[in-house]
Interface confidence: medium
């Protein structure tokens, strides 16, 4: 069967996100992947979207993230823009209204995005073969 266009968009966005570090990609987020053995794919996407939404809601106007220079400012704004796009597309793929995120484990946003990219690429390779 064909790969969802949303999946391709997610991978494209993740590629852009993981290409550049910003002042806040080292901040921590809930690591939903640490113990996701009994979680469905849709739940994983929903929970990933929830984590990303929590992150950008807290840090969109965080002056530590916006930095002092014009370059840092625009990099952070671009990061937030990409995270919002990713959030929107993950919700579309999940098809769920809400999902609990209770894990205690933390990972950096950078590592979280890399892990999500691996999962999405695996999903793409399955649906495109």
């Amino acid at each position: 069967h064909k790969c969802d266009i949303t999946l391709q968009e997610i991978i494209k966005t993740l590629n852009s996100l993981t290409e550049q570090k910003t002042l806040c990609t080292e901040l921590t987020v809930t690591d939903i992947f640490a113990a996701s053995k009994n979680t469905t794919e849709k739940e994983t996407f929903c929970r990933a979207a929830t984590v990303l939404r929590q992150f950008y809601s807290h840090h969109e106007k965080d002056t530590r993230c916006l930095g002092a220079t014009a370059q840092q400012f625009h990099r952070h704004k671009q990061l937030i823009r990409f995270l919002k796009r990713l959030d929107r597309n993950l919700w579309g793929l999940a098809g769920l209204n809400s999902c609990p995120v209770k894990e205690a484990n933390q990972s950096t946003l950078e590592n979280f995005l890399e892990r999500l990219k691996t999962i999405m690429r695996e999903k793409y390779s399955k649906c495109s073969s």
Partner: nanobody
Framework: EVQLLESGGGLVQPGGSLRLSCAAS????????MAWVRQAPGKGLEWVSW????????YYADSVKGRFTISRDNSKNTLYLQMNSLRAEDTAVYYC?????????WGQGTLVTVSS
């Protein structure tokens, strides 16, 4: 041709106020975020404040938060920066900048000197 012309700078005592203006032309002003950026003597460029195209969303650097207010009048193609409770460390050349993924056009700047 994009043109940004700042005005309103000058010498002011600590605690005083100034209002900077930036007249924009050569592009559709209402379609772009705009920013104020400054350069203190011997220092690098520092962003001060940013406002989105519609004027509803604003960002401020920690150093000016609560003292400076950015605003815009899209009918007049003009950007403003109201600066209150000025400090010596606010002394700098203030530039208005068009913001399209980066600050891609700058004015010539207006000097603000805060000194007693």
């Amino acid at each position: 041709e994009v043109q940004l012309l700042e005005s309103g700078g000058g010498l002011v005592q600590p605690g005083g106020s100034l209002r900077l203006s930036c007249a924009a032309s050569g592009f559709t002003f209402r379609n772009y975020g705009m920013a104020w950026v400054r350069q203190a003597p011997g220092k690098g460029l520092e962003w001060v404040s940013w406002i989105d195209a519609s004027g509803t969303e604003t960002y401020y650097a920690d150093s000016v938060k609560g003292r400076f207010t950015i605003s815009r009048d899209n009918s007049k193609n003009t950007l403003y920066l109201q600066m209150n409770s000025l400090r010596a460390e606010d002394t700098a050349v203030y530039y208005c900048a068009k913001s399209a993924g980066r600050f891609d056009y700058w004015g010539q700047g207006t000097l603000v000197t805060v000194s007693s």
